[in-house]
């Protein structure tokens, strides 16, 4: 913590300006009034403070606002944002997209994924849901940031927003996130024709259930291997060899390359070797011919 000293009269600060760059840490601590700093935050980013000096200014704001900074301060944090921890940001209430844009710009090029994720979360909470304007801001200023939102937050996304989402915005989304987004995408694109629908729904298919994959296999979609590899393992396992062949079309040959990777590996283990052989790819590891497959889950459901 910064040492407490009294401010020499000649060092008293009446406004936030460039003279402050010559102040030592303890002088800044003693001479800068936190309320003045908060009122003139818009000047701070134009002054080339050292990281050490920024630490002192942050400490001042933390003391003034122990429950979290007001948005009027947050909006003008500038490079001071780089000093914020996720715990700091969790205390904020942010509703303005201008504030979000300003801080996203500052964070660019810095390792701040946790802080940015928390900031976006606070914006979504502050605005009540991930509305179209917020989604547009994210796609423009922070590609991929949509996936920093938790599945819980993504649950509040209205289907109308889904149209603004580009494939690259979903690149870092995990299984649960896609599980939440997929039904919304299905709803958003339901009136599109077959081929157009597939192009739109493809990035969301990591959340698709088995029955939807079966339906797609009847539509000559020719799914690429990269998309297939992102499908939920538990959704792929019940697919038959014929269904996977129809789903992948000419890309079915790629199964050989991915033979050792999930979900392909797990799917192979569930298929009869006879059926796998019909693909002519030399896939190995299926259920040997002549073995009886007991589906105990069916017996349980009937009992």
């Amino acid at each position: 913590d910064v040492e407490r000293t009294t401010c020499p009269p000649e060092k008293e600060v009446h406004e936030i300006d460039e003279n402050l760059i010559f102040y030592k840490k303890r002088e800044l601590e003693a001479c800068v009034d936190a309320a003045l700093l908060a009122a003139q935050m818009d000047r701070v980013d134009a002054i080339p403070f050292t990281y050490e000096q920024l630490d002192v200014l942050k400490h001042k704001l933390d003391e003034l606002y122990p429950q979290g900074y007001p948005e009027s301060v947050i909006r003008h944090l500038g490079h001071l944002f780089l000093k914020m921890s996720p715990e700091d940001i969790r205390k904020w209430n942010v509703t303005s997209l201008e504030t979000l844009k300003a801080l996203l710009k500052v964070s660019k090029g810095h390792e701040m994924s946790a802080q940015v994720a928390t900031l976006i979360d606070r914006v979504v909470v502050g605005r009540g849901q991930l509305d179209k304007d917020t989604a547009d801001t994210l796609t423009a200023f922070c590609p991929g940031c949509l996936c920093s939102l938790s599945p819980e937050r993504l649950s509040s996304v209205p289907p109308s927003v889904i149209g603004a989402v580009r494939p690259q915005d979903l690149d870092t989304c995990g299984p649960r996130q896609l599980d939440v987004l997929y039904p919304k995408a299905r709803l958003a694109f339901q009136n599109m024709s077959g081929s157009e629908y597939f192009v739109k729904i493809r990035p969301f298919l990591g959340g698709a259930p088995t029955e939807d994959l079966k339906a797609l296999s009847q539509q000559n979609v020719s799914m690429d291997l990269a998309t297939f590899m992102k499908l939920r393992r538990e959704a792929v396992l019940p697919l038959t060899v014929a269904e996977v062949q129809k789903l992948l079309g000419p890309h079915v040959e790629g199964l050989k390359v991915e033979e050792q990777h999930s979900p392909v590996r797990d799917w192979i283990l569930k298929q009869r070797q006879d059926d796998l052989d019909t693909l002519g790819l030399g896939l190995q590891g299926g259920i040997p011919n002549g073995y009886l497959i007991l589906d105990l889950s069916v017996r349980e459901a009937l009992s």
């Epitope: 938790s150 599945p151 819980e152 649950s155 870092t172 299984p175 599980d179 538990e234 999930s262």
Partner: antibody, heavy 118, light 113 residues
Amino acid sequence: EVQLVESGGGLIQPGGSLRLSCAVSGFTVSSKFMTWVRQAPGKGLEWVSVIYSGGKTYYADSVKGRFTISRDNSKNTLYLQMNSLRAEDTAVYYCARDSGGWGYFDYWGQGTLVTVSS
Amino acid sequence: DIVMTQSPDSLAVSLGERATINCKSSQSVLYSSNNKNYLAWYQQKPGQPPKLLIYWASTRESGVPDRFSGSGSGTDFTLTISSLQAEDVAVYYCQQYYSTPPTFGQGTKVEIK
């Protein structure tokens, strides 16, 4: 303060039914992903079911078709309806809050014991 | 389903000494797209529900003492208690949340030597 309080456990005969409740305070049950996890006496933890904030549900294979997870938003309560109970369903049943919907659990109730025996 | 296997089943450690628990998953729980390991650790004391200690393999839950740390990636993970305290006597579980159903390890009992 977040609190989850389970109730409804007890002794039940094989083939019988039971409904467990989990009364929630400190957050709204409709806005969170909520889960049931069970623990057989002296054994480890087994995930049972989840209900997403959007209403989607998943079940462990061992309970599929027999158990139903639901919630009553007005009562801020989570439920687990258990039918066709078997001896192997004997366990302490915990309701837990799924943190952010990611799949790990940050708040747990104290649990309610379900004993299936004739 | 992804099978989680912990070792050892039980562990006796002197007060102040380091305790190490291993957890192995039957398939990788590292999601390559976001470089996150979908793995959590819990502590369960007798007669109590589990308590979340670690998530994303290495992120400590708030309020958890910093003697608890998590490490590892892909299929092999470790929970370390750097200096065992009397109140750390419990059963520890790892859990994957990479795919549905989420699955737990069988548990490791930590006792004082």
